[in-house]
Interface confidence: low
C-alpha cells in the first residue's frame, strides 16, 4: 500500500487552529512536475457533504512530502469530507477523512467501518440533541432509508446493512428530517473486495494474518498497519509518537499524537493514533489496553507490563505478544506467510531463528508438503540470529501448499508454516490482435487470453517479415498498453507472436501462436482545399474542392467529406468514391444548422490531411407553400400571378420568392423577390411575347419555405423581344433577384 497518512488536528475549541496535514512516506512524493510524478493534493470534497461557502482554505506545502490545509473560520467549515491524493501512476491513492460536528443532533458511535464482503455492517448514530422527527439515512448523498424517531434503541439509530458488497462503500449520513445537514452523523463504510482473510482476484489468496488491528488489502494482500505499527504483518510497534510505514514520521507538538485522527489508505480508514481513544482522540487508553483507538488488549503473562503504545513489555528471559514464550525456546523470526515461485525454478529460501542455546545450521530444516525434508546448504550466523539458506530442487506443481520451517535445540522447538504458491508461466492461447494499421506501422493489442498464471508483468512482442529467416525483432511493453510497431515496410506481411512473463525468476512463458499482419498501402499526402459551396435548399449543400498539382499518379481512392454539427455533437460523413470528383451534393442536412465542413483524400483505409475547415450556416426551414397559385396573361409581356397565403405560419412572412422559367428551356430559372408579404398578387413584366412560362413560388420567414405547385401560362401576341422579366406588385415595380 502507498505510505500516505492524512492527519486531522481535533482540538476544536477554535476552528482557526484546526488543520489537516497529508504526509507521504513515498520516495519523492509530492514534488510535482519533476520526474517524481504528480504532487500531493489535499482538498475538501463537496460532492456529498456541501457546506456554506466561506473564505478559501489555505494550502501550504512543507517540503516535498507534506501539505497542510488551514484557514477554517467557523465550525461549519470543518464538517464534511476531506481527501488527500498521493502516489504516482497505478499507485495513486486517495485517503479520506470524514469530520462530524461535535454539536450535531446525531453523532456516529464509530465513523469508519471496515467490513468484509458479505458481512453485515451496522452503523450506529447516537442521539446528541433529540428531535421528534424521522431520521433519514443517506448513502453517498442519495436517500437510502427512513427510521421513525421512536425507533431509537438505547438512544441510538441503527442502520443494518446485511451482505454488503464493495459497491455499498461510501459516505453514509443520518439526519433528522428538516434539520440542517450539518447536524448529521457522517460515516464512512469501506467494504473489502473479499471475504474475511482473503485477497486477490477471485479472493483465492489467504491474507498474512495482520496483527495489532492491521487490515489486509484486498488487492495486494499487504497489511495496512494502524498508525504506530510497522512490519509486513504489523508485528512491530513504533516508538511513542511515531507513525508511517517505517515509523519515519513524528507527531507534531509536545503532546505527541494526542488529539490527532490518522487516516490511511483503504481498507484501513481512520483511527486515533496508538495509545489514544475517544471522539477527539484526547483520552489515553485504559489500563490493559493499547494500540490505535485502544482497541487491543494486552493480557501480559510472566510479569510483562502493558504499554499503551506498544503492548506487552516483557521482562528479561521472555518474549511473544503476551510474554508467553521463554527466551530459551528457539524462535523462527520474520518468516513470510506466503511465497511465490515459478514452475521449474530452483529458488533459495531463507529461514532465520534465534534462541538459547543458539541455533546452528543443522538445527534448522525445511519440510515440503509431501513430507520431504531439506537441509540447509549454508548458514549465516549473526549475534542475534542464525539464517539458514535452502536450495530448493526444481519446483513442480505438486510443491504448492504449506511448507514448514522448523528449528530444534535443547531449549525446545519452534516451527512456522508458510504457503508456497508454484505458478505456471503464462502462455498465450491466441495470437495478438491487430487494432489499426498504417503503411509503416501496426498497432497491436498484445494481451490475449493465456494459460498459466498471472499477473502479467511484461509482454514481449516478436515480429519479422513473413517468410523471412532474419532474426525476430522484439519489443517489450507494459501489459496494459497497446503496442505500435514502427518503421515497417508498406504493403508487407509480418508474422507477429506474443511472449508473456509473470513476476519472478523463471516467469517467462513460451511464445504464443503467430499471426499475419499486413501493413497498409501508403497514406495519401495531398491536402485538398475547399473551393466553395452554395446552399441549394434548407437541407442541401453543393460543395466543391481542389487538390494541389503534383507530378506522378494520384495516391487516393476517393474523398471523405465531414460535416460537424457542434450544437448536437453529431458528425455526418459522406464518401465520394471517385478520386477524380471535385464536387458533391450533400442532402438531408438539418435546416438552420451551423456546420463545420472539411474534405480529405483517402487511400485504402487511410485518410490524408483534412482541408482547412469551412463554416456553413444552412438557412432554417421555412414556412409552408403558398396556396392556389394562379397565372393570367395580361399582355404580350406581362403575366399576373395570384395566390393565397400559406396556412399555419410559424411567424410573419418577410418576402415571397417567384421562380420564372421558360417552359422546355435549358437555362437556369430566375428568382424574383416580392418584398411586400401582405400582397397576394404580383405582375411579372418584361416577358417575351407568345412564350410559355412556368411559375412557382415560396415564402420566406427566417429561411425559404416549400415551393408551391407549378403553374404554366403563355404571354399574348407577337410583341418585341423583352429584356427579361421583372415584377410589379400592384402598381409598384420591384428589382430582379437572380
Amino acid at each position: 500500500a502507498v505510505d500516505l497518512t492524512l492527519l486531522a488536528n481535533l482540538r476544536l475549541t477554535d476552528p482557526q487552529r484546526f488543520f489537516l496535514t497529508c504526509v507521504s512516506g513515498e520516495a519523492g512524493a509530492g514534488r510535482g512536475s519533476d520526474a517524481w510524478g504528480p504532487p500531493l493534493l489535499l482538498e475538501k470534497d463537496d460532492r456529498i457533504v456541501r457546506t456554506p461557502p466561506g473564505p478559501p482554505l489555505r494550502l501550504a506545502r512543507n517540503g516535498s512530502h507534506q501539505v497542510t490545509l488551514r484557514g477554517f473560520s467557523k465550525p461549519s467549515d470543518l464538517v464534511g469530507v476531506f481527501s488527500c491524493v498521493g502516489g504516482a501512476g497505478a499507485r495513486r491513492t486517495r485517503v479520506i477523512y470524514v469530520h462530524n460536528s461535535p454539536g450535531a443532533h446525531l453523532l456516529p458511535d464509530k465513523v469508519t467501518h471496515t467490513v468484509n464482503k458479505g458481512d453485515t455492517a451496522v452503523l450506529s448514530a447516537r442521539v446528541h440533541k433529540e428531535k421528534q422527527t424521522d431520521v433519514i439515512w443517506k448513502s453517498n448523498g442519495s436517500y437510502f432509508y427512513t427510521l421513525d424517531w421512536h425507533e431509537a434503541q438505547d438512544g441510538r439509530f441503527l442502520l443494518q446493512l446485511p451482505n454488503v458488497q464493495p459497491p455499498s462503500s461510501g459516505i453514509y449520513s443520518a439526519t433528522y428530517l428538516e434539520a440542517s445537514p450539518l447536524g448529521s452523523a457522517f460515516f464512512r463504510l469501506i467494504v473489502r473486495g473479499c471475504g474475511a482473510g482473503r485477497w486477490g482476484p477471485g479472493c483465492t489468496k489467504e491474507c498474512p494474518g495482520c496483527l495489532h488491528g492491521g487490515v489486509c488489502h484486498d488487492h495486494d494482500g499487504e497489511c495496512v498497519c494502524p498508525p504506530g505499527f510497522t512490519g509486513t504483518r504489523c508485528e512491530q510497534a513504533c516508538r511513542e509518537g511515531r507513525f508511517g510505514q517505517s515509523c519515519q514520521e513524528q507527531c507534531p507538538g509536545i503532546s505527541g499524537c494526542r488529539g490527532l485522527t490518522f487516516c490511511l489508505p483503504d481498507p484501513y480508514g481512520c483511527s486515533c493514533g496508538s495509545g489514544w481513544r475517544g471522539s477527539q482522540c484526547q483520552e489515553a487508553c485504559a489500563p490493559g489496553h493499547f494500540g490505535a483507538d485502544c482497541r487491543l488488549q494486552c493480557q501480559c503473562q510472566n510479569g510483562g507490563t502493558c504499554d499503551r503504545f506498544s503492548g506487552c513489555v516483557c521482562p528479561s528471559g521472555w518474549h511473544g505478544v503476551h510474554c508467553e514464550k521463554s527466551d530459551r525456546i528457539p524462535q523462527i523470526l520474520n518468516m513470510a506467510s506466503e511465497l511465490e515461485f515459478n514452475l521449474e525454478t530452483m529458488p533459495r529460501i531463507n529461514c532465520a531463528a534465534a534462541g538459547n542455546p543458539f541455533p546452528v545450521r543443522g538445527s534448522i530444516e525445511l519440510r515440503k508438503p509431501d513430507g520431504t525434508v531439506l537441509l540447509s546448504t549454508k548458514a549465516i550466523v549473526e549475534p542475534e540470529k542464525t539464517t539458514a539458506e535452502f536450495e530448493v530442487p526444481r519446483l513442480v506443481l505438486a510443491d504448492s501448499g504449506f511448507w514448514e520451517c522448523r528449528v530444534s535445540t535443547s531449549g525446545g522447538q519452534d516451527s512456522r508454516r508458510f504457503k508456497v504458491n508454484v505458478k505456471v508461466p503464462p502462455v498465450p492461447l491466441a495470437a495478438p490482435r491487430l487494432l489499426t494499421k498504417q503503411s509503416r506501422q501496426l498497432v497491436v493489442s498484445p494481451l490475449v487470453s493465456f494459460s498459466g498464471d498471472g499477473p502479467i508483468s511484461t509482454v514481449r512482442l516478436h515480429y519479422r517479415p513473413q517468410d523471412s529467416t532474419m532474426d525476430w525483432s522484439t519489443i517489450v511493453v507494459d501489459p496494459s498498453e497497446n503496442v505500435t510497431l514502427m518503421n515497417l515496410r508498406p504493403k508487407t506481411g509480418y508474422s507477429v507472436r506474443v511472449q508473456l512473463s509473470r513476476p519472478g525468476e523463471g516467469g517467462e512463458g513460451a511464445w504464443g501462436p503467430p499471426t499475419l499482419m499486413t501493413t497498409d498501402c501508403p497514406e495519401p499526402l495531398l491536402q485538398p482545399w475547399l473551393e466553395g459551396w452554395h446552399v441549394e435548399g434548407t437541407d442541401r449543400l453543393r460543395v466543391s474542392w481542389s487538390l494541389p498539382l503534383v507530378p506522378g499518379p494520384l495516391v487516393g481512392d476517393g474523398f471523405l467529406l465531414r460535416l460537424w454539427d457542434g450544437t448536437r455533437g453529431q458528425e455526418r460523413r459522406e464518401n465520394v468514391s471517385s478520386p477524380q470528383a471535385r464536387t458533391a451534393l450533400l442532402t438531408g442536412l438539418t435546416p438552420g444548422t451551423h456546420y463545420q465542413l472539411d474534405v480529405q483524400l483517402y487511400h485504402c483505409t487511410l485518410l490524408g490531411p483534412a482541408s482547412p475547415p469551412a463554416h456553413v450556416l444552412l438557412p432554417p426551414s421555412g414556412p409552408p407553400a403558398p396556396r392556389h397559385l394562379h397565372a393570367q396573361a395580361l399582355s404580350d409581356s406581362e403575366i399576373q400571378l395570384t395566390w393565397k397565403h400559406p396556412e399555419a405560419l410559424p411567424g410573419p412572412i418577410s418576402k415571397y420568392v417567384v421562380e420564372v422559367q421558360v417552359a422546355g428551356g435549358a437555362g437556369d430559372p430566375l428568382w424574383i423577390d416580392v418584398d411586400r408579404p401582405e400582397e397576394t398578387s404580383t405582375i411579372i413584366r418584361g416577358l417575351n411575347a407568345s412564350t410559355r412560362y412556368l411559375f412557382r413560388m415560396r415564402a420566406s420567414i427566417q429561411g425559404l419555405g416549400d415551393w408551391s405547385n407549378t403553374v404554366e401560362e403563355s404571354t399574348l401576341g407577337n410583341g418585341l423581344q423583352a429584356e427579361g422579366p421583372v415584377q410589379e406588385s400592384r402598381a409598384a415595380e420591384e428589382g430582379l433577384d437572380q
Epitope: 453485515t120 424521522d134 437510502f144 432509508y145 427512513t146 421513525d148 425507533e151 434503541q153 443494518q160
Partner: antibody, heavy 118, light 109 residues
C-alpha cells in the same frame, strides 16, 4: 427460501384476548424489522405494528396502541402479537411480514383469521 | 399520515390487453421513489411486485413495470395473462407510518 407461518387465530368475544405467533425460517431473523399487517374482510391492507431487530424498539398505529403488544424471540425465530381488549372492528386476517431495506414488505405469511364476535 | 389513493377501483379487461393502474399520494414522501406495488389473489397473502417505484422484485415477469416519482405512480401490465387477474395495492414506505392504497381490482371482462 423465506417462510413465515402465522398461528393462534380464532373466534374471540369482544373485550377478550388472543396471542398470535409467526414462525420464521430461511433467513437470519435477528437482522430484520418484522411487522404485523391486517386485512378486514373485503377491505384493503392496514399496517399496524413493527418491531426492530433487537426487540428494543416497537411501533404501533393509533388504532391498536395500548391494546396490542408486538414482541419477538430471536433465539426461536418467532414473532408474537398479544391482542387485548379486542373489538369487532379488529376482525381481520392477520399477516406477519418481513420488512426489506428500506421499507417495502418483501415476504408475507399466509395469514391467520381473527374473528371478534359475541 | 400520507393517504394513498388508487384508481380506478375496478378495471375490467380481457386477457392480452394492457392494464394501467394509478396510485397518488396526498403529499410527497421521503425519497420520492419509495413506493411498492403488491398483488393479492383471493385467499392468498400479498406478493411484492415492484419496489423503488420501478424495480421488479425477484421472479416477477417482465410484463409488469412501474413508473412515476413524487406523488403520481403507475403500474403497467403490458399484456394481461389469466393469472394476472387480482387486486393490486400500492404502498409508500418513505415516511412513517408506511401506508397502503385502497387497491385496484383487475377483473376479466
Amino acid at each position: 427460501e423465506v417462510q413465515l407461518l402465522e398461528s393462534g387465530g380464532g373466534l374471540v368475544q369482544p373485550g377478550g384476548s388472543l396471542r398470535l405467533s409467526c414462525a420464521a425460517s430461511g433467513f437470519t431473523f435477528s437482522r430484520y424489522v418484522m411487522q404485523w399487517v391486517r386485512q378486514a374482510p373485503g377491505k384493503g391492507l392496514e399496517w399496524f405494528s413493527s418491531i426492530y431487530p433487537s426487540g428494543g424498539a416497537t411501533i404501533y398505529a393509533d388504532s391498536v396502541k395500548g391494546r396490542f403488544t408486538i414482541s419477538r424471540d430471536n433465539s426461536k425465530n418467532t414473532l408474537y402479537l398479544q391482542m387485548n381488549s379486542l373489538r369487532a372492528e379488529d376482525t381481520a386476517v392477520y399477516y406477519c411480514a418481513r420488512r426489506g431495506i428500506p421499507g417495502y414488505f418483501d415476504s408475507w405469511g399466509q395469514g391467520t383469521l381473527v374473528t371478534v364476535s359475541s | 399520515d400520507i393517504q394513498m389513493t388508487q384508481s380506478p377501483g375496478t378495471l375490467s379487461l380481457s386477457p392480452g390487453e394492457r392494464a394501467t393502474l394509478s396510485c397518488r399520494a396526498s403529499q410527497s414522501f421521503v425519497g420520492s421513489r419509495n413506493l411498492a406495488w403488491y398483488q393479492q389473489k383471493p385467499g392468498q397473502p400479498p406478493r411484492l411486485l415492484i419496489y423503488g417505484a420501478f424495480n421488479r422484485a425477484t421472479g416477477i415477469p417482465g410484463r409488469f413495470s412501474g413508473s412515476g416519482s413524487g406523488t403520481d405512480f403507475t403500474l403497467t401490465i403490458s399484456r394481461l395473462e389469466p393469472e394476472d387477474f387480482a387486486v393490486y395495492y400500492c404502498q409508500q414506505y418513505g415516511t412513517s407510518p408506511r401506508t397502503f392504497g385502497g387497491g385496484t381490482k383487475v377483473e376479466i371482462k
